[in-house]
């Protein structure tokens, strides 16, 4: 079944490489699983970057190695992607499905176009 | 502390309805599903189905569809069991539940006993 | 409908021994998304439900590591280790898999 999730269309990643957006999805109702996952898509190639399930007990948790940190609240996914480069710059979506209880829903965001500058070398000092 | 509170025992006579109710506390009422469970005498136990407490939409198992309805009342965070044109079989406990990805709370139980 | 069937019906044990408790289901209670969703009830005389062990093997806060849950697929166990006096009653197993969800007929654990 289908649900919406909305995302910010922008967001300029730190001069760390650090971008954070929130990705809110229509109400959970009494979903207890809900899983994330973010997708970056580059021309016609899609791309999982980072996925996780959070329950009704339990805070949202990625794997360890993940480049993705978040935390939840109702209907909201606050989501961080870290080590990014210039070359990851691109169009990341949001994907959220209420796994459990059935029925089972999902939602894609439109994506937020996250830009990445490379910060600039030091100039050497003598 | 949560707690899932039925009301109490009844007896009835075939033909008559009754609703049960379930309130409950300690948590936020329309972030869990509350199911109901039957225990004919000396039986198992019978998932009877289930009512999404945000949306309000009941799911019932077939055995339990026609006569029997769930309902809300969500300010009162409460759920009720109705059961109508009673009939002998329906003499059991029914146990209300809250559901996340277990039946992590239950009621007392609510004790119906139907005969003429 | 998912048939679970639990084995035995009656299971006569001395306090401090172990128990072993099979659930069986009819068809593989994996849902869709990878998880298992099979629990594991005690109702004492006279008592509500209480839960034990869901996902298969996680055990329910506050109850005794005595009580383990492992299984896959359609063949599940519970196992309690040093029965002890507060232990007696009726054991279910449930899957909340695929709907209707269903229960086990029940074991009840007792004294010899």
């Known amino acids: 079944k289908g649900m919406h999730a909305a995302q910010p269309a922008v967001v300029l990643a730190s001069s760390r490489g650090v971008a954070s957006f929130v990705c809110e999805y229509g109400s959970s109702g009494n979903a207890a699983e809900v899983r994330v996952t973010m997708l970056r898509q580059a021309g016609s190639q899609m791309t999982e970057v980072c996925a996780a399930t959070y329950t009704v007990e339990d805070e949202l948790a990625f794997l360890d190695d993940s480049t993705c940190t978040g935390t939840s609240s109702g209907n909201k996914v606050n989501l961080t992607i870290q080590g990014l480069r210039a070359m990851g710059t691109g169009l990341y979506i949001c994907k959220v499905e209420l796994m459990y209880p059935p029925p089972y829903y999902v939602g894609m965001g439109n994506g937020t176009q996250i830009y990445v500058i490379d910060p600039e070398p030091c100039p050497d000092s003598d | 502390q949560i707690q899932l509170v039925q009301s109490g025992p009844e007896l009835k006579k075939p033909g008559e309805t009754v609703k049960i109710s379930c309130k409950a506390s300690?948590?936020?009422?329309?972030?869990?599903?509350v199911s109901w469970v039957k225990q004919a005498p000396g039986k198992g136990l019978r998932w009877m189905g289930w009512?999404?407490?945000?949306?309000?939409?009941?799911t019932y198992v077939d055995d339990f569809k026609g006569r029997f309805a769930f309902s809300l009342e969500t300010s009162a965070s409460t759920a009720f069991l109705q059961i109508n044109n009673l009939k002998n079989e329906d003499t059991a406990i029914y146990f209300c539940?809250?559901?996340?990805?277990?039946?992590?709370?239950w009621g007392q139980g609510t004790t119906l006993t139907v005969s003429s | 409908d998912v048939l679970m069937t639990q084995t035995p019906l009656s299971l006569p044990v001395s306090l401090g021994d172990h128990a072993s408790i099979s659930c069986k289901s009819s068809?593989?209670?994996?849902?869709?998304?990878?998880?298992?969703?099979l629990e594991w009830y005690l109702q004492k005389p006279g008592q509500s439900p209480k839960l034990l062990i869901y996902?298969?093997?996680k055990r329910f806060s506050g109850v005794p590591d005595r009580f383990s849950g492992s299984g896959s697929g359609t063949d599940f166990t519970l196992k309690i280790s040093r029965v002890e006096a507060e232990d007696l009653g009726v054991y279910y197993c449930?899957?909340?898999?695929?709907?209707?969800?269903?229960f086990g007929g029940g074991t009840k654990l007792e004294i010899k």
């Open positions: 539940a809250r559901r996340g990805i277990s039946f992590d709370y």
């Open positions: 300690g948590y936020t009422f329309t972030t869990y599903g």
């Open positions: 009512i999404n407490t945000y949306s309000g939409m009941p």
């Open positions: 068809q593989s209670i994996v849902y869709i998304n990878g998880n298992t969703y």
């Open positions: 996902k298969v093997s």
């Open positions: 449930f899957q909340g898999s695929h709907v209707p969800w269903t």
